[in-house]
Amino acid sequence: KFSKQSWGLENEALIVRCPRQGKPSYTVDWYYSQTNKSIPTQERNRVFASGQLLKFLPAAVADSGIYTCIVRSPTFNRTGYANVTIYKKQSDCNVPDYLMYSTVSGSEKNSKIYCPTIDLYNWTAPLEWFKNCQALQGSRYRAHKSFLVIDNVMTEDAGDYTCKFIHNENGANYSVTATRSFTVKDEQGFSLFPVIGAPAQNEIKEVEIGKNANLTCSACFGKGTQFLAAVLWQLNGTKITDFGEPRIQQEEGQNQSFSNGLACLDMVLRIADVKEEDLLLQYDCLALNLHGLRRHTVRLSRKNPIDHHS
């Protein structure tokens, strides 16, 4: 229920966050699950715990395993599990699938590639970026904050992009790399005021308490390459990331080109283990581009499970 996969490369830094949530003031203890051995908090150790974070500085293949984090609230101890896998560095240039983060898509006018997991680290700009193991050079490539911007994107820009940065811990530097695929949508077309295909305005979505639920926000913005088109979910008028409920996350879908040639975007809102209080929230699907913003509101209602008798 409270478990998360994390991976990294040997001799690089890896920082993992406890999957169990809690207030920042709460003490978090970490253990190596197989031996129940406590992870030290002293920073002189190669592997040490720092609040909600578990730090491997640097990581070793032998560190692979399941780690238990216990968040100590004023009342009860709450447990989460981090499944960590550390891989040997590849001698060739190919990055295996198991080391890849989620694929992102771009277009001629919208080509941001975010560096995965970087928010967990203490790093300073600029990032180094590589495509298929080659360092990116030239004025078309701009490393900005935690993402790469590619100007005048072409089909040939598709590929595997690796960000490399330095994590600093008490004056010591550790390398971190993360790789994700980038795909290019190369179309010519036009832009329209956003049209939300789903959900319908004021839709009532039936969900079952205790089950998982998905809401898809799908909108079309015109034909071909779109500039500054986005779909997103809000909860009670608040961004998902700011709302602070770990069970409710949004997951970006791929650009879609339907049979009518329209350029559309999806954003899936995943609600894990639906709770009664989720029914009190207002779910807004927002679609926006240069023409403006359109909003469709969804509310959840309780679906009573039907008894199936043989």
């Epitope: 809690g22 968040v71 609230s73 004023p74 009342t75 009860f76 308490i209 602070g244 009664e276």
Partner: antibody, heavy 121, light 106 residues
């Protein structure tokens, strides 16, 4: 919707015990710690303790530790608070309550209607 | 045990006036929750985590503070705001409440 429905009013003699029930509905009972808070007539609120219905683990306010027992029945989604060796100053309204999101301990968002326990000889 | 002291004990104001309720804590806490209670009713959560407005609570209610001093503010009193208001800490066990501030509307 989330509901906490408590048992009815009780009149007890000093030295007796009382057991108040709190039936939860509208959410997964084992996902949330349930707390008990009492309020003497014209007085403020006093936290008595809490139970994790999943494990049955309890944390009691030291003031009540010797006399209070909190239990939970997962099969009926009902929590119980038993207070023994009653005295007149235990006359109060007893509430069961829970947080909005459990991990964040974000205040008591849901309350039962309260159970008046009167201790009188 | 963390002791919570609320002041004033009673606050008597006219509709439209600003109400400021204080909660002083015997040792520093990270967050404060506030509740409203009307006669014969269970308490109702108003503010959680010091400054976050609970669902369904009017925006005239706000919370602030840190460490040992916290404040609940009602920017413009309405007649229905007549009630007793309690602060509560969830920083350490036992969880404790303040003694309450009674708000009367003239």
């Amino acid at each position: 919707q989330v509901q906490l429905v408590q048992s009815g009013a009780e009149v007890k003699k000093p030295g007796a015990s009382v057991k108040v029930s709190c039936k939860a509905s509208g959410y997964t009972f084992t996902d949330y710690e349930l707390h008990w808070v009492r309020q003497a007539p014209g007085q403020g609120l006093e936290w008595m303790g809490t139970i994790d219905p999943e494990t049955g683990d309890t944390v009691y306010n030291q003031k009540f530790k010797a006399r209070v027992t909190m239990t939970a029945d997962k099969s009926t989604s009902t929590a119980y608070m038993e207070l023994s060796s009653l005295r007149s100053e235990d006359t109060a309204v007893y509430y069961c309550t829970r947080a909005f999101y459990n991990d964040y301990d974000d205040g008591f968002a849901y309350w039962g209607q309260g159970t008046l326990v009167t201790v009188s000889s | 045990e963390i002791v919570m002291t609320q002041s004033p004990a009673t606050l008597s104001l006219s509709p439209g006036e600003r109400a400021t309720l204080s909660c002083s804590v015997s040792s520093s806490v990270s967050y404060m929750h506030w509740y409203q209670q009307k006669p014969g009713q269970a308490p109702r959560r108003l503010i959680y985590d010091t400054s976050k407005l609970a669902s369904g609570i009017p925006a005239r209610f706000s919370g602030s503070g840190s460490g040992t001093d916290y404040t609940l503010t009602i920017s413009s009193l309405e007649p229905e705001d007549a009630a007793v208001y309690y602060c509560q800490q969830w920083n350490s066990s036992p969880l404790t409440f303040g003694g309450g501030t009674k708000v009367e509307i003239k």
